[in-house]
């Protein structure tokens, strides 16, 4: 059977597997004129791997909370028993009512795009519901995922998220939109408003067109013991225990304290949806308590003090001191000042010495003062903030926050490339290519201090020499290296980088990038002398910029051959002189030649060679540049892209080929060699490249 290259490239030739897993086919290759010897194309068949998705694919989340995805929710497996690390989920469409993030990465950062089944098993993939401004009873979100693990076929998955006040939520004991309790001065009265008690989320379970006809009925099941509830100035009592959400919203509910002490008070209630005109309606209900705190009228509220962030390394433990949490309260003992965690970060938890291993959500100032309270960092490297509420039990709670910075155990200064300074400019801005600090993540807040300055230049910020700068200034392109001494083509300086309390040093290398145009063109003929002129090396732009004649110094090479000065005419005495230095003018005058040698000690064939040059010009630093070129045995039939001053002796004396000889001192043909037409890519070109020499 014959197949053409175009059929192969068009994807029309298919291999159909049958039988054993290992095998293949033999073939010969022909271009119509030549035929290659037989080849064997090996084919290894793999058993088809199938991905499957188990788990409920539903996640129930408490309003405003964070819920990890678990194996009960999302469990992928493959018929090949693939490692869970290699089962990759891609988030095709993220959540609308919240966000998906990784516990070990910055939760404030960009949305999560990929995660693995292993990360799901580890409980590291978290869905956070963001509370909307409008009340709701139940909301539904979806995540569209694509499961992949080559070579298996991708599988699409939808994860349904139900956010509901119906669910029992440890982090949110109330099923109502708000149940915050009330603070009332002793012997006084205070209005209970929807800022403190609000069941409008129950109403939200009714479609909006009918909502205005519904209400929420509160039935007081246990009355306050130290005061009285009034609705529109009418007292509530066992015989009249009801009030409505609409009355609450209208500000008609009041608690009047009876005086005689500051003990806690409150009431218990049942709340349910009430239909039009008081008719029954199916809907949510809840039984809860509303806390009323009576405060001493002479009470002075505690004053929170400024807080210093806690800093510790990943996976370690650090005590929390008064530097992080303290208050001034003249009428409360430290044991009376209570803190409650409202929201914890994902980088660790608070624990009390002697209080078990688990996280604590309540502690006192006495715990802080005695050093019993500690923060335990998990593997995460991100900063986090504890949102706390603090109260002395006699004043309304005050919000406080405790910032936790996770310090890296080590940092590394990444130097991706030396700083290249354009020769004519003599200065260049540093970028992340030169200086970037990473720990287990990028450190954008890094600061740098010069501990060994450059020899031939300065570091500048805002045009002024500096010995200290920041990563931000680097990223903004504000940190500049400028040569002040034009005697070296390179320089270096050493910096000390500091990021989140950890330091590391690094050396930044500076090189000058030659303002030189280099064109080597196609391969050059071995044994020939070719002319070095501005078509090959050109520092004309540098000459214009510096108003000088650039000078070249040969530092190295060529390995096979030499640079020579050629006589101006055949009558000029003497042969070619060896050259170690030359000028742009020499190039323009056509006075330079490159004798291309043959590699010794091996069979004739293509080879590579190079020249390393140092380029000087007035008022700018020198620069090192190289001219890399390929060589091949001389081919008289081939047009070369450079002027040949002489060709190999053997070629000149070869009979019957006078046209292959080019008189010395006269330019040879300048036509470019045409590129052979070769099919780009595909199976055929793979074979051509690998099987014919």
């Amino acid at each position: 059977r014959t197949r053409s290259g175009s059929q192969l490239d068009g994807g029309l030739v298919l291999f159909s597997h049958r039988g054993t897993l290992d095998g293949g086919f033999r073939f010969r290759l022909s271009d119509g004129e030549h035929t290659s010897p037989g080849h064997f194309f090996r084919v290894t068949a793999q058993k088809q791997v199938l991905l499957s998705l188990k788990g409920s694919q539903t996640l129930t989340v408490c309003p405003g909370s964070v819920q990890p995805l678990s194996s009960q929710t999302l469990r992928a497996s493959s018929s090949a028993g693939t490692d869970p690390q290699l089962l990759l989920y891609r988030v095709v469409r993220g959540p609308q009512l919240g966000r998906l993030f990784h516990a070990q990465q910055d939760s404030t950062g960009e949305a999560l795009v990929n995660f693995t089944q292993a990360e799901v098993y580890a409980g590291n993939i978290l869905y956070e519901h963001e509370m909307p401004p409008e009340p709701f009873w139940e909301a539904h979100d979806t995540l569209e995922l694509q499961l992949s693990s080559p070579p298996a076929r991708d599988v699409a998955a939808t994860l349904a998220v139900a956010v509901s006040f119906e669910a029992a939520c440890p982090q949110r004991p109330s099923h109502l939109w708000k149940n915050k309790g009330l603070w009332v001065p002793e012997g006084q009265r205070a209005r209970i408003t929807v800022a403190a008690l609000d069941a409008s989320n129950l109403l939200a379970s009714v479609p909006s067109p009918q909502r205005s006809e519904h209400d929420v009925l509160f039935q007081v099941t246990q009355f306050p013991s130290r005061g009285q509830l009034l609705v529109s100035e009418e007292p509530l009592h066992a015989g009249q225990p009801h009030f409505l959400q609409s009355q609450l919203a209208a500000g008609q509910l009041v608690y009047a304290h009876g005086g005689g002490g500051t003990q806690q008070d409150g009431f218990h209630f049942r709340a349910h949806l009430q239909g039009p005109a008081g008719a029954s309606v199916a809907g949510p209900q809840t039984s809860e308590a509303f806390a009323i705190t009576v405060r001493d009228v002479n009470e002075r509220p505690p004053q929170p003090q400024a807080s210093v962030p806690l800093r510790l390394t990943r996976g370690s433990r650090a005590p929390i001191s008064r530097a992080q949490l303290s208050v001034v309260d003249p009428d409360s003992a430290p044991g009376e000042i209570e803190y409650e965690v409202q929201r914890a970060p994902h980088n660790g938890f608070l624990s009390l010495v002697g209080g078990g291993l688990g996280p604590v959500t309540r502690f006192t100032q006495a715990d802080v003062d005695s050093g019993r309270l500690a923060f335990v960092a998990n593997g995460s490297s991100v900063a986090g903030i504890f949102q706390l509420s603090m109260s002395d039990g006699a004043s309304p709670p005050l919000p406080m926050s405790l910032a936790v910075d996770i310090l890296p155990s080590a940092i590394e200064v990444q130097l991706r490339a030396p700083l290249e300074v354009p020769q004519a400019l003599g200065r260049s801005s540093l970028s992340q290519q030169q200086l970037r600090v990473v720990s287990d993540r990028e450190e954008p807040e890094a600061a740098y201090r010069l501990i060994q300055g450059p020899q031939y230049g300065h570091l500048l910020v805002g045009g002024r020499p500096t010995s200290a700068f920041s990563q931000f200034q680097i990223d903004q392109g504000e940190v500049v290296f400028a040569f002040t001494n034009s005697s070296s083509s390179h320089d270096h300086f050493r910096v000390l980088a500091l990021a989140r309390g950890v330091n590391a040093s690094a050396v930044v290398n500076v090189t000058v990038r030659a303002l030189l145009h280099v064109w080597a063109g196609g391969p050059w003929p071995q044994g020939a002398t070719l002319r070095l002129d501005p078509t090959v090396l050109d520092a004309g732009e540098l000459a214009n910029r510096t108003d000088s004649v650039p000078r070249f110094r040969l530092l190295e090479g060529p390995r096979h051959g030499r640079v020579v000065r050629v006589p101006r005419a055949r009558t000029e005495p003497g042969g070619s002189q060896l050259v170690e230095q030359f000028t742009q003018q020499d190039l323009e005058d056509g006075r330079l030649g490159l004798e291309v040698g043959r590699p010794e000690g091996r069979a004739p064939g293509p080879a590579g060679d190079s020249l390393t040059l140092e380029l000087w010009a007035q008022g700018v630093p020198p620069a090192v540049a190289s001219l890399d070129f390929a060589t091949e045995p001389y081919n008289a039939a081939r047009p070369y892209s450079v002027a040949l001053l002489s060709v190999p002796e053997a070629a000149r004396t070869e009979a019957g080929k006078p046209e292959s000889s080019t008189p010395t001192g006269e330019p040879g043909p300048m036509a470019s060699s045409p590129e052979p037409a070769v099919a780009k890519g595909g199976f055929l070109s793979f074979l051509e490249a690998n099987m014919f020499s």
């Epitope: 205005s212 006809e213 209400d215 009925l217 529109s232 009801h242 409505l244 609409s246 009355q247 209208a250 008609q252 049942r270 349910h272 949806l273 009430q274 039009p276 005109a277 008081g278 008719a279 029954s280 309606v281 199916a282 809907g283 949510p284 209900q285």
Partner: antibody
Amino acid sequence: QVQLQESGPGLVKPSETLSLTCVVSGGSISSSNWWSWVRQPPGKGLEWLGTIYYNGNTYYNPSLKSRVTISVDTSKNQFSLRLSSVTAADTAVYYCAKSWVSWFASWGQGTLVTVSS
Amino acid sequence: DIVMTQSPDSLAVSLGERATINCKSSQSVLSSSNNKNYLNWYQQKPGQPPKLLIYWASTRESGVPDRFSGSGSGTDFTLTISSLQAEDVAVYYCQQHYSVPFTFGPGTKVDIK
């Protein structure tokens, strides 16, 4: 404690429209209550006619729906009943009542309306 | 519509004796949202408006003597006057507030024997 008082003509001719007003005292009509009309033909049982909320939402007895209209005037703290195309069968004592939660918590004294030519 | 029926139409009980009135609804008036029966009992004395006695089938309205009690669930309900007093002579109505239209039973007349 809220008091309700019905007022309106005691005699209405057949095919005309019966109009009654209920004045609420001792409380605001805008408080979260529904306000209702119930009637009782002489020697017979009670029949609910309809209910209105202070915002104007109304519910009517379907058996009378095409003829009954209840409206509220919060500025005067009163609500009204209109029953069109009356016949002798509409002769009754008409009560206004405060609907609280899911019951008729307090009632007016009632007014007898006779439909006769 | 939910149809309410009462039995008996009338009854005469000696002073101090128990009076029992039954009420039946054509469908359940038990609410799933709060587990309450939307069934109320009213007392109407001659020449007076009705007065609320019992709401949610068994909760006595404030100021109502404790000789009045209500029981039952779903569709069958009972009003009991444990020891009839002279001032209890009246017509007693049951009423469902479960769904519109709200409907009353035909009434039960209680007299002293």
